[in-house]
């Protein structure tokens, strides 16, 4: 159920409407919940979840990551730089979320919900951003060839890729949420 459509919302029609920040917070937590559900299926299917973070780090995926220079951490916090990084990062994750679409059997709808909810989150954040020109959109041709390459991997690598995407996306969203709370 997307944020704002749960039974509690229906039962409380006179509640104050959510602020922009509250909607973003709720949206991110909704996506995080979806990621958890997908990871349960991944972990039940393979032993990737037991692999150490260091072992998994030795991959050639260029997944978006927060760094000090992005202005999202306590040191050198910069609201506008950080917001641009969050939106850019989410746009870069979209190709990886597309890759996930055919990776789940029992959680197919959940994978779709994570993808669609991320698109909604990007829209929320773009409304918040003052400097939309600074946001670089990934090249569709590059994304298409990356998708083809990922889908051509053997089963073990596909399992690892799925696990890495989900874990990295979770960490990116958590860092984003903490930073957005300060804006």
């Amino acid at each position: 159920v997307p944020p704002g459509e749960d039974s509690k919302d229906v039962a409380a029609p006179h509640r104050q409407p959510l602020t922009s920040s509250e909607r973003i917070d709720k949206q991110i937590r909704y996506i995080l919940d979806g990621i958890s559900a997908l990871r349960k299926e991944t972990c039940n299917k393979s032993n990737m979840c037991e692999s150490s973070k260091e072992a998994l780090a030795e991959n050639n995926l260029n997944l978006p990551k927060m760094a000090e220079k992005d202005g999202c951490f306590q040191s050198g916090f910069n609201e506008e730089t950080c917001l641009v990084k969050i939106i850019t990062g989410l746009l870069e994750f979209e190709v990886y979320l597309e890759y996930l679409q055919n990776r789940f059997e029992s959680s197919e709808e959940q994978a779709r919900a994570v993808q669609m909810s991320t698109k909604v989150l990007i829209q929320f954040l773009q409304k918040k951003a003052k400097n939309l020109d600074a946001i670089t959109t990934p090249d569709p041709t590059t994304n298409a060839s990356l998708l083809t390459k990922l889908q051509a991997q053997n089963q073990w690598l596909q399992d690892m890729t799925t696990h890495l995407i989900l874990r990295s996306f979770k960490e990116f969203l958590q860092s984003s949420l903490r930073a957005l709370r300060q804006m």
């Epitope: 306590q74 040191s75 709370r181 300060q182």
Partner: antibody
Framework: EVQLQESGPGLVKPSQTLSLTCTVS??????????WSWIRQPPGKGLEWMGV???????YYSPSLKSRTSISWDTSKNQFSLQLSSVTPEDTAVYYC??????????????WGQGTQVTVSS | QSALTQPPLVSGTPGQTVTISCAGA?????????VSWYQQLPGTAPKLLIY???TRASGIPSRFSGSKSGNTASLTISGLQSEDEADYYC??????????FGRGTHLTVLG
């Protein structure tokens, strides 16, 4: 009421691996956004955060202990464990397990175990 | 990772107001509102007093309050009572899901 209980050997020899378990009752360790930390306190000193395992089973460690620390869980027993390798007498401390009720934006510990004394000595 | 800086000792008389400070680098306390405070009585586990800088934990009296200014967080105890004599620790979030504690402050209630 959530309760945490540490267990493990009170005496460990230098260079060996210290292993402790925290048994949680009154709530599931996989509950959304909860995280479970290990925190220690050497005799007469302050608290030191060692590491955490979150609701998805992801682990994060103190940079100063990262190379020696491993945290894992057994969801069927509602337990999480700490392993600290290559111990020295400086690892002598009271070891606490604690719960963070919201690892996404919380970062505080509302429930603690009573602590277990571990002495490193030959 | 270096601990947050707290004064080792603070003292006061019953009824007085005391403040314990907790100073960190800007990647500890600086921007984020994730400071918590704990009370530890001798031989017992720490007990949560304050979280998210100013929010009192369940069952904690209003005599205990938290605040933050720049890179320093503070715990204020008003109407000091003899049972407040204990060690007090601050803690803060560090980047990448890490946490750090202060070195601790022993509060003595005189007289």
């Amino acid at each position: 009421e959530v309760q945490l209980q540490e267990s493990g050997p009170g005496l460990v020899k230098p260079s060996q691996t210290l292993s402790l378990t925290c048994t949680v009752s009154g709530g599931s360790i996989t509950t959304r956004y909860y995280a479970w930390s290990w925190i220690r306190q050497p005799p007469g000193k302050g608290l030191e955060w060692m590491g955490v395992i979150d609701y998805d089973g992801d682990t994060y460690y103190s940079p100063s202990l990262k190379s020696r620390t491993s945290i894992s869980w057994d969801t069927s027993k509602n337990q999480f464990s700490l392993q600290l390798s290559s111990v020295t007498p400086e690892d002598t401390a009271v070891y606490y397990c604690a719960r963070d009720p919201d690892v996404v934006t919380g970062f505080h510990y509302d429930y603690w175990g009573q602590g277990t004394q571990v002495t490193v000595s030959s | 990772q270096s601990a947050l800086t707290q004064p080792p000792l603070v003292s006061g008389t019953p009824g007085q107001t005391v403040t314990i400070s907790c100073a960190g680098a800007n990647n500890d306390i600086g921007t984020y509102a994730y400071v918590s405070w704990y009370q530890q009585l001798p031989g017992t586990a720490p007990k949560l007093l304050i979280y998210k800088v100013t929010t009192r934990a369940s069952g904690i009296p209003s005599r205990f309050s938290g605040s933050k200014s720049g890179n320093t967080a503070s715990l204020t105890i008003s109407g000091l009572q003899s049972e407040d004599e204990a060690d007090y620790y601050c803690a803060s979030y560090r980047n990448f899901n890490n946490a750090v504690f202060g070195r601790g402050t022993h509060l003595t209630v005189l007289g």
